[in-house]
């Protein structure tokens, strides 16, 4: 996965800090106040979508080869820049019964991006 | 995740069989000769992109929160119909040294789809 640099337009990971107060979630999330969630952005042209390290999976590489060899549209839509690696984050929050709960929430932080 | 039934155009899983011969991989993959890779297709309108069952994660929900409020840099970030659950499959193939290898290859089969 590639981190977004200056004028990069290809699929990459953009660092981004989310503030829970800013999105109105501070009333139920106690800790942390925010976190570096990051997100994926950029283009996935067919010629790079199947490249190792850029393709999200073996599955992606297979479909992109098919897309390149067959009429467009036979195997789904365009390739999309999406998370390929994520990690969890511990959250301290109020549940629906106002109990304080500490849980590892999966897939909170985007670590790498690739073309779907 | 939804199964595509031809009636909906919302993000769903489409059944699809890949023949390794069709993509020119039959020279190094011994078995199987192909498999049901499946793929994701369909629309991810903003009102469903963050809903449970169609969304990828907490992360998607946060991004959708920003997107729906027109926040930069998310305003132009399109939600994509992508695999949310992939499964491995065993394959028998020749490695670079022409040894026959049996291995569980990760992320081969799309089991479920959702909106990124």
């Amino acid at each position: 996965g590639i981190d977004c640099q200056g004028g990069s337009r290809m699929c990459c990971r953009q660092e981004f800090f989310v503030d829970f107060r800013e999105i109105g979630w501070h009333d139920w999330i106690i800790q942390p106040e925010g976190y570096a969630m990051n997100f994926c952005i950029g283009q996935c042209p067919l010629h790079i979508a199947g490249m190792p390290g850029i393709a999200a999976s073996f599955h992606t590489a297979v479909l992109n080869l098919l897309k390149a060899n067959t009429a467009a549209g036979t195997t789904g839509g365009g390739s999309c820049c999406v998370p390929t690696a994520r990690r969890p984050l511990s959250l301290l929050y109020y549940d629906r019964d106002s109990n304080i709960v500490k849980t590892d929430i999966p897939d909170m932080v985007v670590e790498a991006c690739g073309c779907s | 995740g939804l199964e595509c039934d031809g009636k909906v155009n919302i993000c769903c899983k489409k059944q699809f069989f890949v023949s390794f011969k069709d993509i020119g991989w039959n020279d190094w993959i011994i078995a199987p000769s192909g498999y049901h890779a499946n793929y994701c297709e369909g629309e991810c309108p903003s009102h469903i992109a963050g809903t449970s069952g169609s969304s990828l994660s907490f992360h998607s929900t946060v991004i959708n929160h920003y997107r729906m409020r027109g926040h930069s840099p998310f305003a132009n970030l399109k939600s994509c119909c992508v695999p949310t659950k992939l499964r491995p499959m065993s394959m028998l193939y020749y490695d670079d040294g022409q040894n026959i290898i049996k291995k569980d290859i990760q992320n081969m089969i799309v089991e479920e789809c959702g909106c990124s």
Epitope: - | A31, P32, S33, R87, S90, I100
Partner: antibody, heavy 123, light 108 residues
């Protein structure tokens, strides 16, 4: 977790029929060829029959050809063996086996086995 | 049809011994040979595929060699859990798929 559960075995008289079933879970059934392998009491393994993922290709051992019929239902993720004109020497533990391959040619490799169902042919 | 012949049909050995089982094909099968282990009352288990490749999770004391018509399965240092019956199987010319008659490995 891959599971293959055979059923339908039992005691049967020579000349009669029996149908074995194998219920499968834990993998994409229609990506794999499936087989029946039998083992007579105290004897070795004998391949009985195999069927490709789409039922297009089917094979039988000479010893059962014309008497046994293999079939599969991909929607029900089940494998079957219809055994007609049973003989005393068909007495065996019948295993349902998942092939790594999807077709019968190429490289069949028996990846996962059920625990077997016992068929006893006796008068 | 390709016939597979194993030898010996039975063998007695002690823990720590090095044991070799052979399998011969009636015609060349390249390296399309697999070995299975079966313990009493259990289903067979894949040990070695493609003549010499160890199935994932199988201890490294097991090894396979050979190509063409002659193949061997070697256990470098027998462990108590290795006493079982071993079968070779050809995957070259199929169907039919043929097994060797088996080699029973017993404690001396």
């Amino acid at each position: 977790e891959v599971q293959l559960v055979e059923s339908g075995g039992g005691l049967v008289q020579p000349g009669r029929s029996l149908t074995l079933s194998c219920a499968v879970s834990g993998f994409t059934f229609d990506d794999h060829a499936m087989h029946w392998v039998r083992q007579a009491p105290g004897k070795g393994l004998e391949w009985v029959s195999g069927i490709s993922w789409n039922s297009v290709s089917i094979g039988y051992a000479d010893s059962v050809k014309g008497r046994f019929t293999i079939s599969r239902d991909n929607a029900k993720t089940s494998l079957y063996l219809q055994m007609n004109s049973l003989r005393v020497d068909d007495t065996a533990l019948y295993y349902c086996v998942q092939d790594l391959n999807d077709i019968l040619t190429g490289y069949p490799l028996f990846d996962f086995w059920g625990q077997g169902t016992l068929v006893t042919v006796s008068s | 049809d390709i016939q597979m012949t194993q030898s010996p049909s039975s063998l007695s050995a002690s823990v720590g011994d090095r044991v070799t089982i052979t399998c011969r094909a009636s015609q060349s099968i390249s390296s399309y040979l697999n070995w299975y282990q079966q313990k009493p009352g259990k289903a067979p288990k894949l040990l070695i595929y493609a003549a010499s490749s160890l199935q994932s999770g199988v201890p490294s004391r097991f090894s396979g060699s050979g190509s063409g018509t002659d193949f061997t399965l070697t256990i470098s240092s027998l462990q108590p859990e290795d006493f079982a019956t071993y079968y070779c199987q050809q995957s070259y010319s199929t169907p039919p798929i043929t097994f060797g008659q088996g080699t029973r490995l017993e404690i001396k």
